[in-house]
């Protein structure tokens, strides 16, 4: 039980960290290439991981202006790191009925980041709802 609890906590920490990185990037939205990117919204149940991978695959880019380029590039790179997998995530990977990334509405970086954050928050909420024990201790 303890190792599975630790795994769940690692997953939760990773999702929370991604939100912090998204919030950091939102401060630099004017230094991002104003390109429209697929931004899933109102993601149907069991397609969260598919939508998550769409956000990770999107070509968010620094406009290479000013002295924020390094922090932006590092933040983008960190957003693309694979999170610890969960049973739910493994199950969802087998779903073939989720929309393709291209089918999602494309949005500029500001809205793209807001929608990414909303999805991460939804995934944290689902993760918490599926947990039976009431502690976040590691």
């Amino acid at each position: 039980h303890k190792s599975s609890s630790q795994g769940q906590d690692r997953h939760m920490i990773r999702m929370r960290q991604l939100i912090d990185i998204v919030d950091q990037l939102k401060n630099y939205v004017n230094d991002l290439v104003p390109e429209f990117l697929p931004a899933p919204e109102d993601v149907e149940t069991n397609c969260e991981w598919s939508a998550f991978s769409c956000f990770q695959k999107a070509q968010l880019k620094s406009a290479n202006t000013g002295n924020n380029e390094r922090i932006i590039n590092v933040s983008i790179k960190k957003l693309k790191r694979k999170p610890p997998s969960t049973n739910a995530g493994r199950r969802q990977k087998h779903r073939l009925t989720c929309p393709s990334c291209d089918s999602y509405e494309k949005k500029p970086p500001k809205e793209f980041l807001e929608r990414f954050k909303s999805l991460l928050q939804k995934m944290i909420h689902q993760h918490l709802s599926s947990r039976t024990h009431g502690s976040e201790d590691s």
Epitope: M12, I13, R16, V74, H125, E136
Partner: antibody, heavy 117, light 106 residues
């Protein structure tokens, strides 16, 4: 058990810098990010920023940007918070706190920094 | 920035009393709210995370509720060790703490 042990009290002159350390034990250091929070005498808590202990990535409270630098040394499982251009308003107790799944789950004992001419 | 406002800033109560502390966010923070307890000269301790979930080892007399912008910390029957200052903290967007509520002995 998880422990965060901070460096001792410091007295600094206005305009100087201070570097506070926080040594972690009882868990895998690079698995958890670390926050820094401060508390002026008789006042509330103020979040300063956080550091990813695995790669030194930082996110700072805009209020402290340009004055605060957070670093880490994985060989000693220690994080550092340096605050420059000190002024009297920076007199406070500075805490490190571990980035738990959804909260700051373990805290250091605090380090009092007094800024006085 | 999200501002967090706690009320009251202080209150006097007796052992056995039911105590309620409120916290209001300047914008919707969903359930992204934590509560900490701090005693004089000590570091804060986590009590409740994600609005209503009790941190391990925290007595069940502590409970949290709310959503959106309005949140409550309740101590169902105040014990001598509960006299302390309580802080709410949002983690919807980075981190911000409330100003604190000091619970004193009546």
């Amino acid at each position: 058990q998880v422990q965060l042990v901070q460096s001792g009290a410091e007295v600094k002159k206005p305009g100087a810098s201070v570097k506070v350390s926080c040594k972690a034990s009882g868990y895998t250091f690079t698995d958890y990010w670390m926050h820094w929070v401060r508390q002026a005498p008789g006042q509330g808590l103020e979040w300063m920023g956080l550091i990813d202990t695995s790669d030194s990535y930082t996110i700072y409270n805009q209020k402290f940007k340009g004055r605060v630098t957070m670093t880490r040394d994985t060989s000693t499982s220690t994080v550092y918070m340096e605050l420059s251009s000190l002024r009297s308003e920076d007199t406070a107790v500075y805490y490190c706190a571990r980035y738990g799944p959804l909260a700051m789950d373990y805290w250091g004992q605090g380090t009092l920094v007094t800024v006085s001419s | 920035d999200i501002q967090m406002t706690q009320s009251p800033s202080s209150l006097s109560a007796s052992v056995g009393d039911r105590v309620t502390i409120t916290c209001r966010a300047s914008q919707d923070i969903s359930n992204y709210l934590n509560w900490y307890q701090q005693k004089p000269g000590k570091a804060p301790k986590l009590l409740i995370y994600y609005t209503s979930r009790l941190h391990s080892g925290v007595p069940s007399r502590f409970s949290g509720s709310g959503s959106g912008t309005d949140f409550t910390l309740t101590i169902s029957s105040l014990q001598p060790e509960d006299f302390a200052t309580y802080y709410c903290q949002q983690f919807h967007t980075l981190r911000t703490f409330g100003g604190g509520t000091k619970v004193e002995i009546k």
